[in-house]
């Protein structure tokens, strides 16, 4: 089945202090490799989350990425700040034998608004 | 060497509650997803009950489900199975299996270890 | 419930395969061996084909499109048990075969 990396979402809104989930699905988990979810494009773009075991304070996996056949990659992200607000990417990377892992395909985005508290 | 001890089975009552646990040893026990597999006397293998290596998803079957509850304690390396309004036809040797580095619950391909087994009993 | 054979029987020192499907579509396969009702099954293959470090190497495993099989080269009685193989459905549930018995003749 061909790869295709889908966010379904363009844009979420969500209220300072509250928690908000990015939606990632894959049509395939081949090639073999990592998926990671970044913020921003290009050179000054910001580690989220990874896939592969390292902890990410506040991001958290919504279903069981170890779970065979799982194609579910979303986040959910807790304790929004304003510092969050940005265009966050779901990326499948091809892992390399033994040069670094390549990026194969990138979700379309999704702009996370962070509203101001309601006082 | 990877060890899987499983206790709490014996003679149970109907209608009644067992708590299983099983202590492993000898790897990683929090990188690892664990499943219990239970056995009916003269019959094959049955998946019972699954969990990941976090502890955050749990995957039931469905002779057990709503009935089921299965937790871990990876800083005592222990995983239990909680079975409630025990039947007859939950009598059999419990097993506790663990996934070696693949997988979540409910993938069997990936049990690479197993227990001893503790027998249960469900009888009036 | 997966698909395998009730039985199969080879003469020692023969090649046996033993085959298993039904598993999700994207699936693997263990392969465990029983000896006797009420022992302990062992794990024989996983992930399609691992082999445990105490697992002689005359086993291995393989998967084809949906099917897995389990060869055991040159059987041995010590071989004569029980073998159940074990996947995920497509809804993520575990799942066995009914097992398959090996004879080892002679």
């Known amino acids: 089945k061909e790869l295709k990396v889908t966010q379904p979402e363009k844009s979420v809104s969500v209220a300072a202090g509250d928690s908000t989930v990015l939606n990632c699905t894959l049509t395939s988990l081949l090639p073999v490799g990592p998926i990671k979810w970044y913020r921003g494009v290009g050179q000054s773009r910001l580690l989220i989350y990874s896939f592969t075991g390292e902890h990410f304070p506040r991001v958290t996996n919504v279903s069981d990425a170890t779970k065979r056949n799982n194609m579910d990659f979303s986040i959910r992200i807790s304790n929004v700040t304003p510092e969050d607000a940005g265009t966050y990417y779901c990326v499948k990377f091809q892992k390399g034998p033994s040069e670094p892992d390549t990026e194969i395909q990138s979700g379309g985005g999704t702009e996370v608004y962070v509203l101001a508290k309601p006082s | 060497a990877v060890t899987l001890d499983e206790s709490g089975g014996g003679l149970q009552t109907p209608g009644g509650a067992l708590s299983l646990v099983c202590k492993g040893s000898?790897?990683?026990?929090?990188?690892?997803?664990m499943n219990w597999v239970r056995q009916a006397p003269g019959k094959g293998l049955e998946w019972v009950a699954g969990?990941?290596?976090?502890?955050?998803?749990?995957y039931y079957g469905a002779a057990v489900q709503g009935r089921a509850t299965i937790s871990r304690d990876n800083g005592q390396s222990t995983v239990r199975l909680q079975l409630n309004n025990l039947r007859a036809e939950d009598t059999a040797t419990y097993y506790c299996?663990?996934?070696?580095?693949?997988?979540?619950?409910?993938?069997?391909?990936?049990?690479?270890?197993w227990g001893h087994g503790t027998e249960v009993i469900v009888s009036s | 419930a997966l698909t395998q054979p009730a039985s199969v029987s080879a003469n020692p020192g023969e090649t046996v395969e033993i085959t298993c499907s039904g598993g999700?579509?994207?699936?693997?396969y263990g392969w465990f061996q029983q000896k006797s009702p009420g022992s302990a099954p062992l794990t024989v293959i996983?992930?399609?084909?691992k082999r445990p470090s105490d697992i002689p190497s005359r086993f291995s495993g393989s998967k084809s499109d949906s099917t897995g099989t389990l060869t055991i080269t040159r059987v041995q009685a010590e071989d004569e048990a029980v073998y159940y193989c074990?996947?995920?459905?497509?809804?993520?549930?575990?799942?066995f075969g009914a097992g398959t018995t090996l004879t080892v003749l002679g």
């Open positions: 999700g579509s994207n699936n693997a």
């Open positions: 996983y992930d399609n084909g």
């Open positions: 969990i990941s290596s976090d502890g955050r998803f749990t």
């Open positions: 074990g996947s995920a459905d497509n809804s993520g549930a575990g799942v």
């Open positions: 299996t663990k996934n070696g580095g693949c997988g979540s619950g409910g993938d069997l391909d990936c049990i690479d270890a």
């Open positions: 000898g790897f990683t026990f929090s990188s690892h997803a």
